[in-house]
């Protein structure tokens, strides 16, 4: 029923989208896990952070991420809709002053230290296309999502409607 072109048509203008206000509409501290319940963890190694996708031991504490949600306005002529559309964008920060970034050249997801205002590479369009799961689409590269590849986070190009609900781009958010 859903053509990927629908997402791309809507989000192609993400580069030009205006984020409403400079402050998030809400923030939420949550642990991030994959569709298959592996935890996303963050480790400081050689003065930089590494991101892992792994099974935690039974009583091991999950890492938390601060999700900051921003409203983004889209003119109707870009959204393909009859009215101005709204979407949610999110930034993800596992520790103070560090944010997840999309490195589109390397197809990688990295943690970068930066000051506000954050660069566009730190913003992801939030989707929930599957029961109680979310997906994160790059603001800077429509059709490209944060996903899991070889026990790491990577950028994954989604090029067909069947792949929009594929497990490796689906994540769960939990307060526990």
């Amino acid at each position: 029923a859903f053509g990927i072109s629908g997402v791309q048509k809507y989000t192609r203008a993400l580069h030009d989208s205006s984020i409403t206000g400079i402050s998030p509409i809400t923030e939420y501290l949550a642990s991030l896990s994959t569709y298959n319940d592996q935890s996303i963890t963050f480790a400081l190694e050689d003065e930089s952070y590494e991101i892992y996708v792994e099974d935690l031991k039974k009583d091991e504490k999950k890492d938390k991420v601060l999700l900051s949600y921003y409203e983004s306005q889209h003119p109707s002529n870009e959204s393909g809709d009859g009215v101005d559309g709204k979407m949610l964008m999110v930034t993800l920060s596992p520790t103070k002053d560090f944010w997840l970034h999309a490195n589109n050249k390397e197809h990688s997801v990295e943690l970068h230290k930066c000051e506000k205002p954050l660069p566009d590479q730190a913003f992801f369009v939030l989707h929930n296309m599957h029961s109680n799961c979310v997906s994160f689409e790059c603001k800077t590269d429509p059709g490209v999502f944060i996903g899991v590849k070889d026990n790491h986070l990577a950028l994954i190009k989604v090029d067909s409607s069947e792949n929009l609900c594929t497990e490796n781009i689906l994540f769960k958010l939990s307060e526990t």
Epitope: H74, S79, K86
Partner: antibody, heavy 121, light 107 residues
């Protein structure tokens, strides 16, 4: 502007299948989730289910075995089917569109006017 | 399923009164809560989304607050057109459950 309109038979016999259509305009069906909600006479709102922008559906657990929500993009229509109906399914049925592109977190600012379905022999 | 409990189920108030309606979630829903107003024979109207955000065209006398499990809808100065039934809805997890409603009546 965004519009939704429910249609279907106003009277359904017990044990039969209730079939309703939600015809929409003013937005792309592939960009937003659409929900079905019902309200029995004199009672509160009950969420039936949603079909998401990605095409997947979620349902009220109490109705899950009887309900199907689908979309026909060529006709700009969403449909609701509820099987094996009883008098308890008598209600005003609404369809409503999500606030946000591709997620449901913002609630539903756009609703149809509702259609009353009575289950009676 | 997440249960949403509204209180009170009904209240009587006068024009100009400050009115507060609460909604309690059976588990955390972050700030993914919406408030709706419904008048007899009409479709519900979105008032507040994301717990605190005022929907387009809604008067500023309406406000929402709360996060986690406890939420409040406040009407700062009740107007004649505000007499209606109000519902909360959680949008954190499916099924997206509603509260049972609060009917605001004229005293």
């Amino acid at each position: 502007q965004v519009q939704l309109q429910e249609s279907g038979p106003g009277l359904v016999k017990p044990s039969e299948t209730l079939s309703l259509t939600c015809t929409v305009s003013g937005f792309s069906l592939t960009n937003y989730g659409v929900h079905w909600i019902r309200q029995p006479p004199g009672k509160g709102l009950e969420w039936i289910g949603v079909i998401r922008a990605g095409g997947s559906s979620d349902y009220n657990s109490a109705l899950m075995s009887r309900v199907t929500i689908s979309v026909d993009t060529s006709k700009n229509q969403f449909s609701l089917k509820l099987s094996s109906v009883t008098a308890a399914d008598t209600a005003v049925y609404y369809c409503a569109r999500d606030h946000y592109f591709s997620n449901s977190y913002g609630g539903s600012p756009y609703w149809g006017q509702g259609t009353l379905v009575t289950v009676s022999s | 399923d997440i249960q949403m409990t509204q209180s009170p189920s009904s209240l009587s108030a006068s024009v100009g009164d400050r009115v507060t309606i609460t909604c309690l979630a059976s588990q955390t829903i972050a700030t993914w809560l919406a408030w709706y107003q419904q008048k007899p024979g009409k479709s519900p109207k979105l008032l507040i989304y994301a717990a605190t955000r005022l929907a387009d065209g809604v008067p500023s006398r309406f406000s929402g607050s709360g996060s986690g499990t406890d939420f409040t809808l406040t009407i700062s100065s009740l107007q004649p057109e505000d007499f209606a039934t109000y519902y909360c809805q959680q949008l954190y997890n499916t099924p997206y459950t509603f509260g049972q409603g609060t009917k605001v009546e004229i005293k």
